[in-house]
């Protein structure tokens, strides 16, 4: 009943709780002397389903048969309507529509750890839409049965709060869950298990690693486990890897030797436990232990390259460059590089340790035969030295690669191709492709990049340190014994028209012609490799088309003569620059009047 129902009653048959699809009879009846005051036969009883009228009747009672009620709760209210007055609420009732519980499925129980408590889970099946009580029973030895009830709306988990111990590990226990509501009851199939079946060990803890004599080859992993653990799974991986190495061990007693770890690598280790070979389940993985393995002496050899620069008649500058060893080759933190420079005929040698750089520059005499050796050192030792004889890399013209080209290959890549040298191509031992940003001043501080290519290759894709809209000077060297030949080309991965034209800084007259001088376009405004400059001129105040002179771009050139100007005529001159993508806007304008005699 939903209110005091002083004026009448609402009765529901067969019950306030019905099975989905059932029919109910609802009766609303007035108590004596509770009708309309003057004309009792004027009583109009109205039945509402929620706020919607579904039936009415004149008299002291109303009967209504209701079908098709939905799952859940439906509210029925009976009201009395008298002439010239508002409807008066008489009484009401809630009807609960649901279903009997389905048989609970997939009942399973687990005890987390030897000191944990038994908890069971199951699948309820479809919602009953009614108050449903679940009772979980656990029967075992000594004729004893534990039970616990759950009165939550959605109950699919219960913890008994009791702990099974391994006094009789083979003793059988049987769990069963029963669901009961007003429409029926249903029990799960019984689940029978032993202590060993349901105890899931706690994950191992207190994981440590030891390296005997600071060596990666003598490594032991230690951990602590619950007392009954028989099996362990170990998994480990470098911290930057997604793939695990897995090891299964039996009766490890909290320790295991690992033999295949890489030096100077941070690893993640995890361990899991199990009580029995084929019963029960594995524990969760332990918390991760992260540890770095010790260093070992470097393996591999440095990739070394060099550049020679003429200083004067007696001296030359040698710049050495080398690439870092890979992590797997360095096998530790590289503390320094050792560079040894030796004059081969006289036997003079000097050694220097370089820290923080991968290059070294020195000045040596132009005479003599020179060699260098470079090695990398960590705390455990040094790599094998890379030895190079210093030679004139471009001296042998017949070894120069032919038809060198450089073409853009997608974003920030340049494909360099060439043909083998005229001289016996089989004499080539390797090609080296070298590239550096083009700087008009020939700046030796510009970083040098290189890659090595096998003698049968005639192309190389360069992508390291390649930026869009920058011009690179690319050289291809063919090396054969103590000889080398080279060819060079300019190339860019992406280009567009230069952002500005050259700035004319001076115009001078010489014997009836003029010499124009200009400042180079700043590198960041060239937008790729420049192909040509154009010099434009026209008579001042003239509307005629300007004349022009196109000159090929050369790095060092910044002046050019013009001898087709008329004396005593004032001209306006300006310049542009071109890449393969187009022409720049024009640079500054300069006026000039040639003072020479007229023809």
């Amino acid at each position: 009943k939903i209110d005091a129902c002083k004026r009448g009653d609402v009765t529901v048959k067969p019950s306030h709780v019905i099975l989905l699809g059932s029919t109910v009879n609802i009766t609303c009846s007035l108590k004596p002397r509770q009708g309309c005051f003057h004309y009792s036969r004027r009583n109009k009883l109205i039945l509402y389903k929620f706020d919607r009228r579904i039936n009415f009747h004149h008299g002291h009672s109303l009967n209504s048969q209701v079908t098709g009620l939905p799952l859940g709760t439906t509210l029925f209210v009976c009201k009395l309507a008298c002439i010239n007055s508002d409807e008066i609420q008489i009484c009401g009732a809630e009807i609960f529509v649901g279903v009997a519980p389905e048989q609970p499925q997939n009942l399973s129980c687990i005890q987390k750890g030897e000191q944990g408590t038994v908890a069971c889970t199951w699948e309820r099946g479809r919602d009953t839409h009614l108050y449903t009580e679940y009772t979980l029973q656990l029967s075992g030895p000594k004729n004893l049965t534990w039970q616990k009830q759950c009165k939550d709306i959605y109950c699919d988990y219960l913890d008994f709060g009791i702990n099974l111990t391994p006094e009789s590990p083979e003793s059988n226990f049987t769990a069963k869950v029963t669901a009961v509501n007003s429409l029926g009851s249903s029990s799960s199939l019984p689940s029978t298990f032993t202590f060993l079946d349901i105890v899931r060990p706690l994950p191992p803890w207190d994981i440590r690693i030891k390296f005997q004599k600071a060596s990666v080859s003598r490594c032991t992993l230690y951990w602590r486990d619950e007392g009954l653990v028989l099996l362990n799974r170990l998994r480990y991986r470098p911290s930057n890897s997604r793939l695990w190495n897995m090891v299964n061990v039996t009766k490890a007693k909290g320790r295991h030797d690992l033999l295949d770890l890489k030096p100077f690598t941070e690893y993640e280790f995890q361990i899991s436990s199990k009580l029995h070979l084929y019963k029960g389940s594995w524990s969760d993985w332990s918390e991760s232990l992260r540890a770095q393995t010790p260093e070992e002496e470097p393996t591999g050899m440095l990739d070394v390259w060099y550049m020679k620069r003429h200083i004067d008649y007696s001296r030359q500058q040698i710049s050495l460059f080398w690439k870092n060893l890979s992590v797997s080759e360095a096998r530790g933190k590289i503390l320094h590089y050792q560079v040894t420079l030796q004059e081969l005929t006289g036997g003079k040698a000097m050694t220097q340790n370089i820290t923080g750089h991968t290059s070294w520059t020195t000045v040596i005499p132009r005479t003599g035969n020179w060699a260098v050796a470079v090695s990398a050192a960590n705390s455990k030792g040094s790599s094998l030295p890379t030895r190079i004889n210093i030679m004139n890399l471009c001296e042998a013209g017949l070894l120069a690669p032919r038809q060198v080209s450089a073409n853009s290959e997608g974003m920030d890549n340049i494909l360099v191709t060439w043909q083998p040298p005229r001289k016996d191509p089989s004499a080539v031992q390797e090609y080296v492709v070298e590239w550096r940003e083009l700087h008009p001043g020939g700046d030796t501080q510009v970083p040098l990049n290189w890659l090595r290519s096998r003698p049968y290759n005639v192309s190389a894709l360069i992508s390291e340190n390649i930026k869009s809209y920058i011009c690179y000077e690319i050289r291809v060297y063919a090396l054969s014994g103590d000889q080398g030949g080279c060819s060079s080309i300019l190339g860019n991965s992406k280009h567009k028209a230069p952002l500005s034209g050259p700035h004319i800084n001076a115009i001078t007259e010489e014997k009836g012609s003029i010499l124009i001088s200009w400042n180079s376009i700043p590198v960041q405004e060239q937008m790729g490799c420049l192909l040509h400059y154009r010099i434009y001129w026209k008579e001042r105040d003239s509307n005629s088309q300007p004349q022009l002179c196109e000159i090929p771009y050369r790095v060092s050139q910044n002046s050019h003569p013009i001898n087709s100007l008329q004396p005593r005529v004032t001209y306006v001159l300006w310049m542009t620059a071109l890449t393969a993508a187009g022409e720049s806007s024009h640079g500054n304008e300069r006026e000039f009047c040639l003072q020479g005699k007229a023809n």
Partner: nanobody, 122 residues
Framework: QLQLVESGGGLVQPGGSLRLSCAAS????????MGWYRQAPGKQRELVAA???????AYADSVKGRFTISRDNAKNTVYLQMNSLKPEDTAVYYC????????????????WGQGTQVTVSS
């Protein structure tokens, strides 16, 4: 120290009912499990019923459906409602309390009461 005092025993005819009470003089909030044991002359003490702080209950097969165990933490009391009593239920009934979680299938209590006699006879 926890003191347990049983009451409610007595003589009853077969089919009759009794309600045993066990009052703890200290707080039973720290007690995980409480139980009723019984010992008939010449027999070993056996667990009749137990209840944990979380509300799990246990019954020996011989009393299942006839006896009900409950606890009232506010009154520091545990009850055993015994219905449909049989002559074989005759024994001294002991109250038991265990501070630790139940560490075995059966209850092994830290604390015991002095016992109350239940006799079922016509």
């Amino acid at each position: 120290q926890l003191q347990l005092v049983e009451s409610g025993g007595g003589l009853v005819q077969p089919g009759g009912s009794l309600r045993l009470s066990c009052a703890a003089s200290g707080s039973i909030f720290s007690i995980n499990a409480m139980g009723w044991y019984r010992q008939a002359p010449g027999k070993q003490r056996e667990l009749v019923a137990a209840i944990t702080s979380g509300g799990s209950t246990a019954y020996a097969d011989s009393v299942k459906g006839r006896f009900t165990i409950s606890r009232d933490n506010a009154k520091n009391t545990v009850y055993l409602q015994m219905n449909s009593l049989k002559p074989e239920d005759t024994a001294v009934y002991y109250c038991n309390a265990d501070r630790d979680p139940i560490t075995s299938w059966y209850v092994r209590g830290d604390y015991w009461g002095q016992g109350t006699q239940v006799t079922v006879s016509s």
